[in-house]
Interface confidence: low
């Protein structure tokens, strides 16, 4: 289903994963960031939209067109895109076009995800970014350099903000011991807009008290804590924003009324069973990997919807019944 987002002069269509996201620009100067450098001898300008929006996993086009005073310049040129800040930010893309050539040969494309769509000979440095991630949410700056008979260069000062949206993804769900011999649960999710988190479980309604954690890197992380798990059973964390929802669960089982010895035996038995299972899995994998040359095609990323993590934890304490979280 197509979602259209107007961003001033920039209209971006966000399509299902794998499709292009096209950005159409209205070149009316008052709607764009138009940066002009003029003197009696020359006039440079760059036109970029203030913002482009696209969904994680999709592609986006960062538009950038320019004008320059060297009317028929046909010499060598270099097109550059930086991230973060103008002039000093790290380059994410660079290409060079030979004299008379309309094709810019790529010299740098960070992670192979950046491709020049525009033709620098036609004053277009528009860049396509593939497989967007939340970490790509930053400001980008285009730059062009002439290096033939004419030596000149110009770089966008304001840049274009790439706003990456993402459906929620639960990145961590865990159960930790509390000081009072109880247990607490933590759920951390990322998404943009930042998702709302809710806990549900035995003797709980929906606990919506989510605490936003500080941004780590460029992730949009939110954490919700369930301070006291008072009943055995399944506890589910749900993360939701305007783009979707994701769920993950932990299971809490405590051993009640058993002697210390039988509790230890139960736990050791469970651990032994799991160790055997693990050995079986490893043996099966080893058997499958026996051929020396095995082609392993790239696997597409898993869908984030309904992704579940199961926490396994046991606490040994003579004054408190032990607990374990087991996979179903």
């Amino acid at each position: 289903m197509e979602k259209s987002i107007w961003l001033l002069a920039c209209l971006a269509w966000v399509l299902p994963t794998g499709s292009f996201v096209r950005t159409k620009i209205d070149t009316t100067e008052n709607l764009l960031n138009t940066e002009v450098h003029s003197s009696p001898a020359q006039r440079w300008s760059m036109q970029v939209p203030p913002e482009v929006s696209a969904e994680a996993g999709d592609a986006a086009v960062l538009p950038c067109t320019f004008t320059h005073p060297h009317r028929h310049y046909d010499g060598p040129l270099t097109a550059i895109w930086r991230a973060g800040e103008p002039y000093a930010g790290p380059q994410v893309f660079r290409c060079a076009a030979a004299r008379g050539s309309e094709l810019c040969q790529t010299a740098l494309s960070l992670h192979g995800r950046f491709r020049l769509l525009g033709n620098p000979r036609r004053n277009d440095l528009s860049l396509r970014v593939e497989r967007l991630a939340l970490a790509d949410d930053r400001r980008y700056f285009c730059r062009v350099e002439f290096a033939g008979d004419v030596h000149d260069r110009y770089e966008s000062r304001h840049g274009v903000r790439l706003h990456v949206t993402a459906a929620p993804r639960i990145v961590n769900i865990s159960v930790l011991p509390s000081p009072a011999h109880a247990f607490r649960a933590l759920c951390t999710a990322e998404g943009e807009p930042p998702p709302a988190l809710a806990w549900s479980g035995p003797a709980l309604g929906n606990s919506l008290a989510a605490v936003r954690s500080p941004r780590e890197g460029h992730g949009h992380l939110v954490t919700a804590e369930l301070p006291a798990l008072t009943h055995d059973g399944r506890y589910t964390c749900t993360a939701a924003n305007s783009l979707g929802r994701s769920e993950a669960s932990v299971y809490l089982f405590r051993f009640h009324g058993a002697s210390g010895a039988s509790t230890v035996a139960l736990l050791l038995g469970a651990l032994g069973f799991k160790a055997l299972l693990l050995l079986g899995v490893l043996a099966a994998r080893a058997a499958r990997r026996r051929p020396e040359h095995l082609d392993t095609p790239d696997t597409p990323p898993r869908s984030q919807a309904q992704e579940s993590n199961y926490e396994n934890l046991s606490q040994m304490n003579p004054r408190s019944p032990p607990a374990t979280m087991c996979s179903p």
Epitope: L15, S19, F20, R22, K24, A98, G100, S101, E102, L103, Q105, L117, N119, R128
Partner: antibody
Framework: QVQLVQSGGGLVQPGRSLRLSCAAS????????MHWVRQAPGKGLEWVSG????????GYADSVKGRFTISRDNAKNSLYLQMNSLRAEDTALYYC???????????????WGQGTMVTVSS | QSALTQPASVSGSPGQSITLSCTGT?????????VSWYQQHPGTAPKLMIY???NRPSGVSDRFSGSKSGNTASLTISGLQAEDEADYYC???????????FGTGTKVTVL
Amino acid sequence: QVQLVQSGGGLVQPGRSLRLSCAASGFTFDDYAMHWVRQAPGKGLEWVSGISWNSGSIGYADSVKGRFTISRDNAKNSLYLQMNSLRAEDTALYYCAKGLWPSYDLDAFDIWGQGTMVTVSS
Amino acid sequence: QSALTQPASVSGSPGQSITLSCTGTSSDVGAYNFVSWYQQHPGTAPKLMIYEVSNRPSGVSDRFSGSKSGNTASLTISGLQAEDEADYYCSSYTSTIPPFVFGTGTKVTVL
């Protein structure tokens, strides 16, 4: 199923006009550049014209410039070639082809139509 | 603009490897890594076999491989099979207008 279905060819007198159509299905038409390539009987392939995904950039072979017009209707998933002032040397099998990228001036054509014959003769 | 130069015909026996050449100039093949190869059986539309010098589209046999040296691009067909008998055309992006140039074509015959 990804396919391009062509129509509109035929016999036409020199100086007259003809319009070729190409209906696309099975892929997101407005993500890609589209092209016309022709092949004269017993000859090789010749690129005729290309159009970017949003019609913002268009190119023609020198031999057809000023006489042929390429266009597309993304809402109808269709590509067109309006051929005016036809000449005997325009006689060929005309193919529509899908580009790999949104810009027409990138090079590879990964999906081809079945071809439609245009014969210019008096 | 001149077409890229290809040998008129190349032949080989089943199981053999053959190499088709495509010679251009420093304005096309020599300048850019945008060379494509197409296979055309009689009476059918061309099929993309290689793009950007050496990339194979999905569905194309790995017996087909592409390379480039200087102003000459090459298509190698290994383990030649009867169904490989067809016409082969190379194409390149070029800095001239129009931006595409095709080769003259090579007829491959499987003996």
